[in-house]
Interface confidence: low
C-alpha cells in the first residue's frame, strides 16, 4: 500500500500576497520529483489575514505580528512538520506598500522590517519580505495563468480546463485588478515595442516571449473611488457629494484628511471650507461612467496607440484572463458568464446601480455594507477601464474570461512569483529527469 | 405641511447686531439645509449663507462672511441667523429657505423679515 | 461665486410668450444634472420656485412655464403670458452654493 503523504516526495512553499487592503497567505504543493513540470504546482490553503493591508500598521507596527498569526498558525497546521524547515515563505507586497514608500520609504521599510522579524520567528525557511514592482506583479500574474492553464506546455495535460480550454499553445493575457493598481500584460501580435518600460523577454519551456505589462499606480479600484471623490468634491455643492455611483438613498460621510492621505489625489488636492462631506447616492450608471472617465486622460499620448495618462498599449491580441477585483466584482455581479455580452453587462450595471438602498440592504443582507455599497462603482469602473482605458470593444470582450481559480488554484501573481523564485520554470523544455535552471524574469 | 414661520421686523442702529429667527414646523430641519437671502428695497436676491443642521456645517457668501453668523437649534427645530456691525444699506428684507437634500427642489421660504438700520 | 446675468425687463401682451434669459460664467451641469431653478416673485410676497433641475416643473405651478437649456445657457418660457404672471422672474444656481440672477421684470405691454 502507498504510504498516503511521504514527506519527502510533497513540497510546500508559502506566499504572502500583502496587497493595499488586505492580506492573503496561500499555501502550494507539488511533488518533488515533477517540479520542473508545467501545471504540477497547486494552491491547498488560501487563509485571509484578518484586518486591512500591512502598509496601514504604519503607526501600529507593534501589532503586524498579532496581525500575521493566525495565518502563519495555520500554515503549520497544513504543512507536515517534517516540511517546515524547507518550506520557503515569501512575502510580496504590491501597490499599497509602493505608495506608502512614495510618502516615506522610511516608514515603508519600518513596516517591512517588522513583517520580515514576525516571519522569521515561524519554522519555516523566510525568504524575505519586499515590495514587488508593478512590472513584476504584471509578470507573474500572466506567468501564473498561462502556467496553470498548460500553456507552457508541449505535452498533453493531464487535466482538462474548462471554460478556458483551447487547444492552441497561444498564451492568454492577463488582466489584474487590485485595490490600489492594475496591470495588464499580454504577448501582442508585433514582437517589436515603442515603449521598452514596457516590454519583458523571457525564455520559458524553450520558447522565447516577448511580453507587454504596465502597472497603473492608483488605478485600482479603490484607490480609482479615492480619486474620482477628490476630483468630485472640487466642484461639487460644497459638503454634499451628490454621487452618481452609488445607490439612491446612500449617505455616507468622508473625511477630507482621509481623501487627502493618498498620494493619488495629490493631483486634485484643494484647500476646501470643510473638513467633512456627506456622499449621497443618486444611483446613475450613465452619470458614474462619465465620472469615471474623467480620471482617464486620453487626450496626450506621444507612441501610435496609448491606453491612458500617455501610457503605450499595442493592440489587443487574443484571450484574457481577468482576476482577482475583476473577478470578484463581476461574480458578485453575476457577470462572469462567457454568454453574457458586454451590452447586457452595460443593461445590467445601469439596473443595479439605480436599486435603492434600502433595497440593495436588503437583497444583501449578508454582505458588509462597506463592500456592498461600492459594487455599483466598482463594476461601473472596470467596464470603464476595460473599454475606454484598454481598448476592448463590444466585440473583443467575448475574448475577456472573468477567473476565480483555475484548477482550484488562484488566479493571481503569488504563484507564478514563487515558481519563479524556486526556480521551477526552466528555461528549457525540461528532460525526462528535472533540470536546474533559473529564468529571466 | 411645511411652514416656516420667521421673527417680526427689527429696527437698528448703525453698529449694532441683529438676531433673526426662522421656526420650521411640519418636518425637522435636518432634512434640509438652510438658507438666508437678503433683498434691499427696489433690489435683486443675494444669497448670504446655509447651515446643515445634521452636522452644524455652515458657508457664507464672501460678501457677508465677516459678519453672518447662521446657527440651529434641532430641539426647537428653529434657525438663527445674525448679523453685526450694520450699515444704513443692509436695511433689507430677509429670507429663510429650505433646500431639500440633496438640493433638487427648494420647496419652503418664510415670510421675510424687514430690518432697518437708522440712526 | 458663479456669476448670473438676466436678460433685461420685458413687456409683453397678453396670450403672448415671454422669454427670459439666463446666463451663467461657468457651468452649472454636474455628471448630467442641471442645476438651475427659476423663481418668481411679487410684491411684497417670498420667491415662489418655478423651474428647478432647469425643466423641472415645480408642483403647483401651471404648465405654461417651462424652463430648457443646459451647461451655461438657460431660458424661462412663459407660453402664454396672463395677467398673474406679472413679477419678477430670478434664475438661480445651487451647484455651487446658490447665486442669484438680477432679475426680470415682465409687464404686460
Known amino acids: 500500500t502507498q504510504n498516503k503523504a511521504l514527506p519527502e516526495n510533497i513540497k510546500y512553499g508559502i506566499v504572502l500576497d500583502a496587497g493595499s487592503s488586505h492580506t492573503s497567505l496561500y499555501i502550494y504543493k507539488w511533488p518533488a520529483e515533477k517540479e520542473n513540470d508545467t501545471g504540477v504546482v497547486h494552491q491547498v490553503e488560501e487563509c485571509r489575514v484578518k484586518g486591512p493591508g500591512i502598509s496601514k500598521y504604519v503607526q501600529k507596527v507593534n501589532e503586524i505580528g498579532i496581525y500575521l498569526t493566525d495565518c502563519m498558525e495555520r500554515a503549520r497546521e497544513v504543512i507536515p512538520r517534517s516540511q517546515h524547515q524547507e518550506t520557503p515563505v515569501y512575502l510580496g507586497a504590491t501597490a499599497g506598500m509602493r505608495l506608502l514608500r512614495m510618502e516615506s520609504e522610511e516608514l515603508a521599510d519600518r513596516v517591512l522590517d517588522v513583517v520580515e522579524r514576525s516571519l522569521s520567528n515561524y519554522p519555516f525557511d523566510f525568504q524575505g519580505a519586499r515590495i514587488i514592482t508593478g512590472q513584476e506583479e504584471g509578470a507573474y500574474g500572466w506567468i501564473t495563468i498561462n502556467y496553470l492553464l498548460g500553456k507552457f506546455s508541449q505535452k498533453t495535460r493531464w487535466f482538462s480546463i474548462v471554460p478556458y480550454e483551447t487547444n492552441n499553445q497561444e498564451t492568454f493575457g492577463a488582466l489584474d485588478l487590485g485595490g490600489a493598481s492594475t496591470q495588464i500584460t499580454f504577448v501582442p501580435q508585433n514582437q517589436t515595442t515603442e515603449s521598452p518600460d514596457n516590454a519583458l523577454q523571457f525564455r520559458l519551456y524553450g520558447k522565447d516571449y516577448n511580453v507587454y505589462t504596465h502597472s497603473f499606480l492608483c488605478y485600482g479600484k479603490d484607490q480609482a473611488l479615492w480619486q474620482k471623490l477628490a476630483k468630485d468634491i472640487q466642484v461639487a455643492s460644497n459638503e454634499i457629494l451628490r454621487d452618481p455611483c452609488f445607490h439612491p438613498g446612500y449617505k455616507k460621510v468622508v473625511n477630507v484628511s482621509d481623501l487627502y492621505k493618498t498620494p493619488c489625489t495629490k493631483r486634485f488636492e484643494m484647500t476646501l471650507p470643510f473638513q467633512q462631506f456627506e456622499i449621497q447616492g443618486i444611483g446613475n450608471y450613465q452619470q458614474c461612467h462619465q465620472s469615471v472617465l474623467e480620471l482617464f486622460n486620453t487626450s496626450y499620448c506621444p507612441y501610435s496607440q496609448c491606453a491612458f495618462n500617455g501610457i503605450f498599449l499595442p493592440p489587443l491580441q487574443g484571450d484574457f484572463g481577468a482576476f482577482s477585483a475583476f473577478y470578484f466584482v463581476m461574480n458578485f455581479l453575476n457577470l462572469t458568464s462567457e454568454k453574457v455580452s458586454q451590452e447586457k453587462v452595460t443593461e445590467m450595471m445601469k439596473k443595479f446601480c439605480s436599486q435603492p438602498w434600502e433595497e440593495i440592504k436588503t437583497s444583501y443582507a449578508g454582505v458588509k455594507e462597506k463592500y456592498l455599497s461600492e459594487y455599483c462603482f466598482s463594476g461601473t469602473y472596470i467596464l470603464s477601464l476595460l473599454l475606454q482605458g484598454y481598448h476592448f470593444t463590444a466585440d473583443s470582450w467575448e475574448h475577456i474570461h472573468f477567473i476565480g481559480k483555475i484548477q482550484g488554484s488562484d488566479a493571481g501573481w503569488t504563484l507564478g512569483y514563487m515558481l519563479n523564485l524556486t526556480n521551477m520554470i526552466p528555461a528549457e523544455q525540461p528532460l525526462s529527469t528535472p533540470l536546474s535552471h533559473s529564468t529571466y524574469v | 405641511e411645511v411652514q416656516l414661520v420667521q421673527s417680526g421686523a427689527e429696527v437698528k442702529k448703525p453698529g449694532a447686531t441683529v438676531k433673526i429667527s426662522c421656526k420650521v414646523s411640519g418636518d425637522s430641519i435636518t432634512a434640509y439645509f438652510m438658507h438666508w437671502v437678503q433683498q434691499a428695497p427696489g433690489k435683486g436676491l443675494e444669497w448670504m449663507g446655509r447651515?446643515?443642521?445634521?452636522?452644524?456645517?455652515?458657508k457664507y457668501a464672501e460678501k457677508f462672511k465677516n459678519r453672518v453668523t447662521i446657527t440651529a437649534d434641532t430641539s426647537t427645530n428653529t434657525v438663527y441667523m445674525e448679523l453685526s456691525s450694520l450699515r444704513s444699506e443692509d436695511t433689507a428684507v430677509y429670507y429663510c429657505?429650505?433646500?431639500?437634500?440633496?438640493?433638487?427642489?427648494?420647496?419652503?421660504w418664510g415670510q421675510g423679515v424687514m430690518v432697518t438700520v437708522s440712526s | 461665486d458663479i456669476v448670473m446675468t438676466q436678460s433685461p425687463d420685458l413687456a409683453v401682451s397678453l396670450g403672448e410668450r415671454a422669454t427670459i434669459n439666463c446666463r451663467t460664467q461657468?457651468?452649472?451641469?454636474?455628471?448630467?444634472?442641471?442645476?438651475m431653478n427659476w423663481y418668481q416673485q411679487k410684491p411684497g410676497q417670498p420667491p415662489k420656485l418655478l423651474i428647478y433641475l432647469a425643466s423641472s416643473l415645480a408642483s403647483g405651478v401651471p404648465d405654461r412655464f417651462s424652463g430648457s437649456g443646459s451647461g451655461t445657457d438657460f431660458t424661462l418660457t412663459i407660453s402664454s403670458l396672463q395677467a398673474e404672471d406679472v413679477a419678477v422672474y430670478y434664475c438661480q444656481q445651487s451647484r455651487n452654493l446658490w447665486t442669484f440672477g438680477g432679475g426680470t421684470k415682465v409687464e404686460i405691454k
Open positions: 461657468q457651468t452649472v451641469d454636474h455628471y448630467g444634472t442641471t442645476y
Open positions: 429657505a429650505t433646500e431639500r437634500v440633496p438640493g433638487f427642489e427648494t420647496d419652503y
Open positions: 447651515i446643515d443642521p445634521d452636522h452644524e456645517r455652515t
